[in-house]
Interface confidence: low
């Protein structure tokens, strides 16, 4: 696995100082030329001897992180991440300070890279014995041990084949994506392949680990295999999605399809610096690779996304929860799972596509035809979430070319909106992941215009809270999305509801576990609502027989969602009236022992209505959907009694799940109503019509 072995070098301090003095001015200059450490080293050593070493900032504790998958760890190389506002000069000084303090203890270290542009920090080769010391350095936020990342494709068949023509009914403009530049972080590529010749610029960026062992002698066609195929899928002349997109390739994976987190970080930094030096149109970055969960890789992706770059990544081929992998688990990245021609999740050997709440959508990823590096006119079929991600990168390039001003949030919502819904056979996924995994397969929009009028919303699931009595789970929307409603779900039914609360100047959705519960999920409904002003109105438990009620009382504010939260362990069987009084659509109704929260929003032309579907008899699932032209913003259940497992939105349908009460024989407790709040924006519709 190409681990960097780091051996302790026993250099006692007096001997080290003596060596530096013996080197004299000429020797000192040579030393500085090599690693730039000579003067700083001596000064730091002296200041430490005098007790003048700078202490870490008071009250902050830096943390150490490493890959949970042991075989993928690369001990001996560490990414030291510094606090957000740390300047480059401070990063360099901190790195040198580490070297000096290490030398004093008899260890040699090597600074491999100093990060700036995306994240402040440095990459250091050192003994793990020095971690405790490094964590105490000033400015240090956290340290992460380097780890491996892998290409996420499998070459199924290697025969040379002619690519099929796209179906006539598929929207395929010949120059789609022409305003967009797609960066590919992958293996080397065969840039003279006729599929991609003249479309891909090979940058001089290369940061790859040595190949493992000597069994794999570098062979160009093998080394280029993965990257060439993906470049062809994105923008190939015959088999590409966005035939007009131009691409730039960075080599971060070696001939075995293996790279490192640190190499990928340096690649992302390279892209950010290129973007600053020469700003172009919209940028898409394709990361067809996966490694174990990495805080630093996710953080770098977040920074790049917030700089206006669209990142698309492979969910991973491990038939596992994508949240356990990076960059798939980064919320700012568009994470793509793989399906086959029958819209089934792709099986890859004994494994298959990843799944779960960190996947945004699926795309074709089995037997995908693309450029083969075996010759300049060869084609090959490959499978994996890399291929699926390449499809979505191509679709993103098409959309951005048609609407260059789209933000990441707008692009993600459009990708979701135009996807084929509910076509994947969910039985393939583990039972506990089915509800969390989006049943969406990416598709090109029917035309590149005409989406402007739509109110776009998506469902965001939190991580699981864990089972402790006071455990909570939090779901968040993207920075430029509005949280329009909040719901919760527990498989055991033991929960204490949910509420919207302000966190860092933004509303978040928090769900509460109950005593004896196995844990809860918070479910946020996140929407694109320009110029919106939203607030939460709360009514404490009423204790009255009619239950607790709250409404939107501000002029021009409409109800977009209802939440309820209770402190008692069991709400019992009290049943408030299922149908709310006529003429009061802006009202949330709930259990008398619960506090009720109404999400109330004012936005130009926003109108909403409440839609209910009640079932008098016990049923495990009750649904209600919004009509064409309306978008589901809120989904909740009436009543909030303990047999209701929770409510959540699936596309434009509100789903309320209940425990199977048929065995109890209590039909009064079995009655459940699904309450949907459906909204539309007349303002967006008018603006769209004016454009057309």
């Amino acid at each position: 696995m190409g681990t960097v072995s780091s051996r302790r070098s026993w250099w006692p301090l007096p001997l080290l100082l003596l060596l530096l003095l013996l080197l004299g001015p000429a020797g000192a200059r040579a030393q500085e030329d090599e690693d730039g450490d000579y003067e700083e080293l001596v000064l730091a050593l002296r200041s430490e001897e005098d007790g003048l070493a700078e202490a870490p900032e008071h009250g902050t504790t830096a943390t150490f992180h490493r890959c949970a998958k042991d075989p993928w760890r690369l001990p001996g190389t560490y990414v030291v991440v510094l606090k957000e506002e740390t300047h480059l000069s401070q990063s360099e000084r901190t790195a040198r300070r580490l070297q000096a303090q290490a030398a004093r203890r008899g260890y040699l270290t090597k600074i491999l890279h100093v990060f700036h542009g995306l994240l402040p920090g440095f990459l250091v080769k050192m003994s793990g014995d020095l971690l405790e010391l490094a964590l105490k350095l000033p400015h240090v936020d956290y340290i992460e041990e380097d780890s491996s990342v892998f290409a996420q494709s499998i070459p199924w068949n290697l025969e040379r084949i002619t690519p099929p023509r796209y179906r006539a009914d598929e929207y395929q403009p010949p120059d789609g994506g022409s305003l967009v530049e797609v960066y590919l972080l992958d293996t080397s590529i065969q840039s003279d392949h006729r599929e991609i010749e003249g479309r891909v610029m090979v940058t001089d960026f290369e940061n790859v680990p040595e190949e493992d062992g000597t069994r794999f002698h570098r062979q160009a066609s093998k080394c280029d295999s993965h990257g060439t195929h993906l470049a062809g899928v994105v923008s190939g002349r015959d088999a590409g999605v966005a035939k007009g997109a131009s691409m730039r390739s960075l080599r971060v994976l070696n001939c075995q399809g293996k790279g490192t987190v640190s190499g990928t970080l340096i690649g992302l930094e390279f892209i950010r610096k290129s973007q600053l030096v020469q700003p172009v149109g919209p940028l898409v970055v394709l990361l067809p690779l996966a490694g174990g969960y990495s805080r630093v890789l996710n953080a770098a992706c977040q920074r790049l996304a917030r700089a206006g770059v669209v990142l698309v990544t492979a969910a991973g081929n491990f038939r596992d929860d994508a949240c356990l992998y990076s960059p798939a688990s980064a919320p700012e990245v568009i994470t793509v799972g793989a399906t086959n021609a029958q819209d089934q999740p792709v099986t890859l050997g004994t494994l298959g596509t990843n799944f779960g709440r960190c996947v945004d959508l699926f795309a074709p990823g089995e037997d995908i035809i693309g450029a083969s590096s075996d010759c300049s006119t060869c084609f090959v079929s490959q499978s994996g979430t890399s291929q699926a991600a390449a499809h979505v990168a191509g679709i993103a390039a098409m959309m951005l070319s048609a609407e260059p001003e789209l933000t990441l949030a707008e692009l993600r919502q459009r990708l979701i909106h135009f996807s084929a819904k509910d076509v994947i056979n969910e039985a393939w996924f583990p039972e506990d992941q089915r509800v969390l995994t989006p049943n969406l397969v990416a598709a090109l929009p029917p035309s590149t215009h005409g989406a402007g009028w739509q109110l776009f919303c998506r469902t965001v699931w939190s991580a699981h809270s864990g089972p402790t009595r006071m455990a909570t789970a939090v779901a968040r929307c993207a920075p430029d999305e509005e949280l329009l409603s909040c719901s919760s779900f527990s498989r055991s039914g033991k929960r204490r509801g949910e509420r919207m609360e302000a966190q860092g100047g933004k509303l978040v959705c928090r769900a509460h576990n109950a005593f004896g519960g196995e844990g809860v999920y918070a479910i946020a409904r996140c929407c694109l609502l320009p110029q919106a002003n939203c607030s939460v109105h709360t009514a404490p438990p009423a204790e009255a027989s009619m239950g607790t009620r709250v409404h939107c009382h501000q002029q021009g504010h409409v109800l977009t969602g209802c939440s309820s939260h209770w402190e008692v362990e069991d709400l019992g069987t009290h049943k408030p009236p299922v149908l709310r009084p006529r003429g009061q659509p802006n009202q949330c109704v709930g259990h008398r022992e619960a506090s009720i929260h109404a999400s109330c929003c004012h936005a130009p032309g926003l109108e909403c209505k409440v839609k209910e579907h009640g079932i008098p008899a016990p049923q495990e699932q009750v649904t209600v959907a919004c009509e064409e032209g309306w978008t589901l913003t809120g989904c909740s259940a009436l009543p909030g009694t303990s047999h209701v497992l929770g409510a959540y939105a699936v596309d434009n349908t509100c789903v309320v799940r209940s425990r199977d009460v048929s065995t109890t024989g209590s039909t009064s407790e079995g009655a459940v109503t699904a309450v949907a709040i459906c909204c539309r924006s007349r303002h967006l519709a008018q603006a769209s019509q004016e454009l057309q």
């Epitope: 696995m1 190409g2 681990t3 072995s5 998958k69 042991d70 075989p71 993928w72 690369l74 491996s148 892998f150 290409a151 996420q152 494709s153 499998i154 070459p155 199924w156 068949n157 290697l158 025969e159 493992d212 062992g213 000597t214 069994r215 794999f216 002698h217 062979q219 066609s221 093998k222 993965h226 075995q256 399809g257 293996k258 081929n317 491990f318 890859l348 050997g349 004994t350 994996g384």
Partner: antibody
């Protein structure tokens, strides 16, 4: 059903040759690296040779280097082991084994095995 | 041919845990190469149990778990059952050989 079936084993005199075959079915043979592994009677497993999916990479154990030749025919879904200058210590049950795909994070693992073919070298 | 070293045999009563070690060198296990574990019942072909140190193959019960530290990998069988009686082999890639290397094998007996 994914299956590997070895054939070609038998009794042979020292110094003579033998050719083993392995027929693959139930998977895309041309996508996988393949290996031969042997097991002497009452002994442990010994890796003999490996070949990548397109025959670009071939490697042998020191004990058979220069005497054995591994090859494959993707069109026929078949793997071969040509064994020359056979010795008594080559007596073993020879297994054909499929290796995890090239781009897997866990390459070198043998996920599918045949039932083996017995080679006895004796005068 | 250098081999990975395993104990010749280990035994345990039903329900107990047993651990099999697999010691290599910096050229194989210690060099960061993956370690895989196989189970072989008498007269049968080996079966891949754990790949990449920790990933169980499909259908393998979670009683089987793997770990690695330095030049040594380990396979632990917790809650030993009668059907676990078999030979177990570790395997890794060896950089100096440009090929795979197997462990000497461990005979697990359920008392």
């Amino acid at each position: 059903e994914v299956q590997l079936v070895e054939s070609g084993g038998g009794l042979v005199q020292p110094g003579r040759s033998l050719r083993l075959s392995c027929a693959a079915s139930g998977f895309t043979f041309s996508s996988y690296s393949m290996n031969w592994v042997r097991q002497a009677p009452g002994k442990g497993l010994e890796w003999v040779s490996g070949i990548s999916s397109s025959s670009s990479y071939i490697s042998y154990a020191d004990s058979v280097q220069g005497r054995f030749t591994i090859s494959r025919d993707n069109g026929k879904n078949s793997l071969y082991l040509q064994m020359n200058s056979l010795r008594a210590e080559d007596t073993a049950l020879y297994f054909c084994a499929r290796e995890y795909d090239f781009w897997s994070a866990y390459y070198d693992a043998f996920d599918v095995w045949g039932q083996g073919t017995m080679v006895t070298v004796s005068s | 041919q250098s081999e990975l070293t395993q104990p010749r045999s280990v035994s345990g009563s039903p329900g107990q845990s047993v651990t099999i070690s697999c010691t290599g060198t910096s050229r194989n296990i210690g060099g960061g190469n993956d370690v895989h574990w196989y189970q072989q019942h008498p007269g049968k072909a080996p079966k891949l149990l754990i790949s990449g140190v920790i990933e169980r193959s499909s259908g393998v019960p979670d009683r089987f778990s793997g770990s690695k530290s330095g030049n040594t990998a380990s396979l632990t069988i917790s809650g030993l059952q009668a059907e676990d009686e078999a030979d177990y082999y570790c395997q890794s890639f060896d950089g100096s050989l440009s090929g795979s290397v197997f462990g000497t094998g461990t005979d697990v007996t359920v008392l």
